[in-house]
């Protein structure tokens, strides 16, 4: 019987060009975490295997960094990075637990890059 629950950072937003940490946490189970897969829609971003370490998908290796912990850091964000991300915890003997995070990448704020007017 699967008793565990996945907690995630939920819906998050970040600025274009910045970075963000995707985090999931598995609780309420004594099952052993054997592998964690990070996916974006149907694309595999990275795998962290308990024995074999981190493996980043070649198409993402320039912009994805492992950690902290079992989390994943996305760098040099673009608006195309907006979307759903999934952490898939493979556990023994329970099976798989999946968490969902929605990331919205925003254009840099007007306050930071917009024109500044001074009222005389």
């Amino acid at each position: 019987m699967m008793t565990g629950t996945i907690e995630t950072t939920g819906n998050i937003s970040a600025e274009k060009g910045g970075s963000i940490i995707l985090q999931c946490h598995l609780s309420s189970t004594t099952a052993q975490v054997t592998q964690v897969n990070w996916e974006q829609q149907d694309q595999l971003l990275a795998i962290c295997n308990a024995d074999l370490g981190w493996h980043i998908s070649p198409s993402f290796k320039d912009r994805v960094a492992p950690g902290p912990g079992l989390g994943l850091t996305l760098q040099s964000l673009t608006v195309n990075d907006t979307g759903e991300y999934f952490c898939i915890y493979h556990t023994y003997p329970d099976g798989t637990y999946t968490g969902r995070i929605f990331l919205e990448v925003l254009e840099s704020s007007v306050a930071e890059h917009g024109a500044r007017f001074q009222i005389p």
């Epitope: 295997n49 493996h55 003997p93």
Partner: nanobody, 118 residues
Amino acid sequence: EVQLVESGGGLVQPGGSLRLSCAASGTAASFNPMGWFRQAPGKEREFVAAISWSGGSTNYADSVKGRFTISADNSKNTAYLQMNSLKPEDTAVYYCVTYSAYDFRNAWGQGTLVTVSS
């Protein structure tokens, strides 16, 4: 169910080379990592090297960096460990490991013995 069969072990002189092979059957996702561990007599099992089946990502233990090379042939579901400049301290049983989605944990081979001695 994932099954792993190692081959290529044997006796070699210090400074020599060996190539280990690991044939996997029943393996699942093509990106799941595969790797090698080793266990010397009277010592704990230790990580040697790992690679994603796609070949795009590798990890090595510091003790073998620059001497060992891990590779994978996805079409044959076979991984290799090329071991050069072997030392007596490389003597161990070498085990192949990969993730098995069948039972949610890593599958281990039976091991192949490598002996480095003059």
